[in-house]
């Protein structure tokens, strides 16, 4: 038996694709959603972080360290940041 395979090209409209990963905006607290090859990514406003911007708080990305302070930690949702302050400055934000 010979099996004949017919290859068809079909133009798929957006309606046929179903909901995209950003449909309904999974990002909380005013975060903006962008689609990635496998899922989605939220860009969070200052003061929020986490996969869906659901966690309230400041991270190193917010630039919390003043007067030349170096921000250590704060890279993942469970860790708080610490500012290492240059000589002559102190306080949690080297202020």
């Amino acid at each position: 038996d010979h099996h004949h395979h017919h290859h068809e090209q079909k133009l798929i409209s957006e309606e046929d694709l179903g909901p995209g990963p950003c449909d309904g905006n999974p990002c909380a607290n005013g975060g903006s959603c962008s689609e990635t090859p496998r899922s989605f990514e939220c860009t969070c406003p200052r003061g929020f972080y986490g996969l869906r911007c659901e966690v309230s708080g400041v991270t190193c990305a917010d630039g919390p360290c003043f007067n030349g302070g170096l921000c250590v930690g704060g890279a993942d949702p469970d860790s708080a940041y610490i500012c290492h302050c240059p000589p002559g400055f102190q306080g949690s934000n080297c202020e």
Epitope: C60, A61, G63, C65, F66, G68, G69, C71, G73, P87
Partner: antibody, heavy 118, light 108 residues
């Protein structure tokens, strides 16, 4: 003006510990943060870590499990220990002081080449 | 970590010309905590600029830095023979401290 001078063996065997000392003159070791940086032809400049007399210490995560930086206040020196070395740790090692207005490097030693080889 | 990408890799110019070196960060560098260094063969790097635009002690005013966020520039207004070297940028806003891969400035 701060002057820095590295010293230590130029050849270390694989799996052993690299030990370097930086002697500081022209400034008190309690006045600055002190850092180590290394340079390889392939990877360029790599920050290793820093330490402050008050206890603030910070290491590059890529080396953290193998690095110790310590201060010797009485001799105005600070040191680097890097354990379990491999050929990838062959580099020029620099000691440096960190600026008073931020974590940039304002004074550097001349550098010392450390080769890891059996 | 913040990745710094410098361009061009090599810049060929003549003495007296203007040099423009770029440093681009993978994410915004807080408060413009960026430094520039010059390195000559067999020597340690030398601090030129910190805070994106402040000249270090003893650095001639032909060197200037600018930029904020993710894009930073080092400009040498009129190249002197001693300016031909490798230049590195470094960010110190977020740990780990990172450096760019360098731009080689060579005589044309």
């Amino acid at each position: 003006q701060v002057h820095l001078q590295e010293s230590g063996p130029g050849l270390v065997k694989p799996s052993e510990t690299l030990s370097l000392t930086c002697t500081v003159s022209g400034g008190s070791i309690s006045s600055y943060y002190w850092s180590w940086i290394r340079q390889t032809p392939g990877k360029g400049l790599d920050w290793i870590g820093y330490r402050y007399y008050s206890g603030n210490t910070n290491y590059n995560p890529s080396l953290k499990s193998r690095v110790t930086i310590s201060l010797d206040m009485s001799n105005n020196q600070f040191s680097l220990k890097l354990s379990s070395v491999t050929a990838a740790d062959t580099a020029i090692y620099y000691c440096a002081s960190i600026g008073v207005a931020g974590f940039y490097f304002d004074y550097w030693g001349q550098g010392t080449l450390v080769t890891v080889s059996s | 970590e913040i990745v710094l990408t410098q361009s061009p890799g090599t810049l060929s110019l003549s003495p007296g010309e203007r040099a423009t070196l770029s440093c681009r960060a993978s994410q915004s560098i807080s408060r413009s905590y960026l430094a520039w260094y010059q390195q000559k063969p067999g020597q340690a790097p030398r601090l030129l600029i910190y805070g994106a635009s402040s000249r270090a002690t003893g650095i001639p005013d032909r060197f200037s830095g600018s930029g904020s966020g993710t894009d930073f520039t080092l400009t040498i207004s009129r190249l002197e023979p001693e300016d031909f070297a490798v230049y590195y940028c470094q960010q110190y806003g977020t740990s780990p401290i990172t450096f760019g891969q360098g731009t080689r400035l060579e005589i044309k």
